[in-house]
């Protein structure tokens, strides 16, 4: 009879056994192993019990103790299990970022192991377990779905296996995976509301602004804000689930048309864009031309007045004929034309809104000098003694200088108050001089006595 | 559909003048800002000169400046590039292109016309 | 500086992604836009904006930036994308309206 101990081995991948091989016959012709396993004998005296060492044992097997004895042969089998943990504990790639309601695949390969049997693959989130399968096929895979909810937000999810060899007097062995870290966000299916001018004047600032709400984690949100090629960069302020992005807008002559105005924002892998036109345009105030800005009395004046070549202008409230950007009037200057305002309103429609601009420009009349009997009578009669005020005002452009006098000597105080006396009395001669001549004009002062009775 | 046609390339002696047409159709000509690219036979492209839509501002590379003028005609749909005092280093295929603003990026482009400066 | 740098030569495996890049100040402030020219003809847009391609323009071609650089990324490139590729920027140093970079010739392979 042979026999064989341990009759039962659990040892690691690359392991070493000691196996006796025993006969109960006191002297076999033949006491041995077969395995295809490297094996060393130890020597020991007697010759019915041989001990071998196994060494370098990479997978189960059952070596087989022979002996030949008188009464016959016979064997007996030991049998090996080699343990090993898994190679490879591996969860599929995600991309880090996933949407809130969405069904996330975990999946979970493990690459080698032994024993199968006692072999554990728990999918985790935290230390809470979702899913715990016997690892089966190489490489085994565990799968489980998971509702992304908002407080999965930072979770991190793994797979560990087991190893459980505590049955067979050894201990528990686990392997871990690499962590998944989960970020979850809420990006609205609604675009962002973009508030700006719709028109916006070459050389001007104007403010744009760009609002979400509805987004988790807000702090996570990336806005991105341009016109046209130019990046611009807005002060971002977040409340609890929303945004707004303020930025100002400088535009010069090279923005000049139509441009695209984009706020774009992007949450975890989607974006949500909004787009907006916006019309930069340039529209310089009208001119007001005078053939001269001062001209003589009776001289024929010429007003012009030029716009945008799209606008349209009135000049004094007169439309261009035809309507255009250019309107123009004749007159013939009279002083009453002195001071007189000629006002040019131009109008030029930018993307369906009327934008007005005005100009006006003063025509200075050189006339006179006038002295006539409304504004310098010719004759006065004052009591004597009594207050008067002389009044003689002389009409021009440029203002003439008045002087009457008396003989060329005797001046008559024109504007001041005066105690009427006989000397006052008499015919003066008014002469009003400017740089556009002289008038010369008659007033005689008469004084009446009081009467003695 | 847009489309950009230049004319008035060829053969000019150096020191002449040359004037460029750019025959637009397909876009309203007026709402758009035109420009002049360049680029000599086997080298990269070259900006030479803008106008904006309405034709109030006029923009050009230092190496034309004061040489070329740019202007339009848009009750004619057309772009203008009058080049005087030739050089040269002014030999290249002539490109006009659109631009839904004076500083943007080019949205169509003509076939282009051969100017030639001969010493 | 108003200068716009791009590698002269590039080279791509058919189907396979290439990158093409042009660095430049002027960057930080505006966006790129992109231009294939194939030899003898006229170039054509292929991206503008932060990446927005016109009508037409494969999605294949996309485009992004950061700092002062900005990228021209064909993905599964194919024969027909074999030509000249310049990017375009709005001038920031104020001495041109808008300028080029030199170019980059794109081969694909295979």
């Known amino acids: 009879q042979t026999s064989v101990s341990p009759s039962k081995v659990i040892l690691p991948r690359g392991g070493s056994v000691l196996v006796t091989c025993s006969t109960s016959c006191d002297q076999p012709k033949l006491l041995g192993i077969e395995t295809p396993l490297p094996k060393k004998e130890l020597l020991l005296p007697g010759n019915n019990r041989k001990v071998y060492e196994l060494s370098n044992v990479q997978e189960d097997s059952q070596p087989m103790c022979y002996s030949n004895c008188p009464d016959g042969q016979s064997t007996a089998k030991t049998f090996l299990t080699v343990y090993w943990t898994p190679e490879r504990v591996e969860l599929a790639p995600l991309p880090s970022w996933q949407p809130v309601g969405k069904n996330l695949t975990l999946r979970c390969q493990v690459e080698g192991g032994a024993p199968r049997a006692n072999l554990t693959v728990v999918l985790l989130r935290g230390e809470k377990e979702l899913k715990r399968e016997p690892a089966v096929g190489e490489p085994a895979e565990v799968t489980t779905t998971v509702l992304v909810r908002r407080d999965h937000h930072g979770a991190n999810f793994s797979c560990r296996t087991e190893l459980d060899l505590r049955p067979q007097g050894l201990e528990l062995f686990e392997n871990t995976s690499a962590p998944y870290q989960l970020q979850t966000f809420v990006l609205p299916a609604t675009p962002p509301q973009l508030v700006s001018p719709r028109v916006l004047e070459v050389d001007t600032q104007g403010t744009v602004v760009c609002s979400l709400d509805g987004l988790f984690p807000v702090s996570e949100a990336q806005v991105h804000l341009a016109l046209g090629d130019q990046r611009l960069n807005p002060t971002v302020t977040y409340g609890n689930d929303s945004f707004s992005a303020k930025a100002s807008v400088s535009v010069t002559a090279e923005d000049e048309g139509t441009q695209r105005l984009t706020c774009a924002v992007i949450l975890g892998n989607q974006s949500q864009e909004t787009l907006q036109t916006v019309t930069i345009y340039s529209f310089p105030a009208p001119n007001v031309i005078l053939t001269k800005p001062e001209v003589s009395e009776g001289t024929e004046v010429t007003v012009k007045c030029e716009a945008h070549p799209r606008a349209k202008v009135t000049l004094n409230g007169v439309p261009a004929q035809p309507l255009g950007p250019r309107a123009q009037l004749l007159l013939k200057a009279t002083p009453e034309d002195n001071g007189r305002s000629f006002s040019c309103s131009a109008t030029l429609e930018v993307a369906g809104q009327l934008i007005h601009k005005n100009q006006t420009r003063e025509l200075r009349v050189l006339y006179g000098p006038r002295l006539d009997e409304r504004d310098c009578p010719g004759n006065w009669t004052w009591p004597e003694n009594s207050q008067q005020t002389p009044m003689c005002q002389a009409w021009g452009n440029p203002l003439p200088e008045l002087k009457c006098l008396k003989d060329g000597t005797f001046p008559l105080p024109i504007g001041e108050s005066v105690t009427v006396t006989r000397d006052l009395e008499g015919t003066y001669l008014c002469r009003a001089r400017s740089t556009q001549g002289e008038v010369t004009r008659k007033v005689t002062v008469n004084v009446l006595s009081p009467r003695y009775e | 559909q847009v489309q950009l046609q230049e004319s008035g390339g060829g053969l000019v002696q150096l020191g002449g003048s040359l004037r460029l047409s750019c025959a637009a159709s397909g876009f309203t000509f007026s709402s758009y800002a035109m420009s002049w690219v360049r680029q000599a036979p086997g080298k990269g492209l070259e900006w030479v000169s803008a106008i904006s839509g309405s034709g109030g501002s006029t923009y050009y590379a230092d190496s034309v400046k004061g040489r070329f003028t740019i202007s339009r005609d848009n009750s004619k749909n057309t772009l203008y590039l009058q080049m005087s005092s030739l050089r040269a280093e002014d030999t290249a295929f002539y490109y006009c292109a659109n631009s839904a603003y004076t500083g943007g990026w080019y949205d169509y482009w003509g076939h282009g016309t051969l100017v030639t400066v001969s010493s | 500086s108003s200068e716009l740098t791009q590698d002269p030569a590039v080279s791509v495996a058919l189907g396979q992604t290439v990158k093409i890049t042009c660095q430049g100040d002027?960057?930080?402030?505006?966006?790129a836009s992109w231009y294939q020219q194939r030899p003898g003809q006229a170039p054509v847009l292929v991206i503008y904006?932060?990446?927005s391609r016109p009508s037409g323009i494969p999605d294949r071609f996309s485009g992004s930036s950061s700092g002062n650089t900005a990228s021209l990324t064909i993905t599964g490139a194919q024969a027909e994308d074999e030509a000249d590729y310049y990017c375009?920027?709005?001038?920031?140093?104020?001495?041109?309206?808008?300028?080029f970079g030199g170019g980059t010739k794109l081969t694909v392979l295979g």
């Open positions: 002027s960057l930080r402030t505006y966006y």
């Open positions: 904006g932060e990446n």
């Open positions: 375009n920027s709005r001038d920031s140093s104020g001495n041109h309206l808008r300028v």
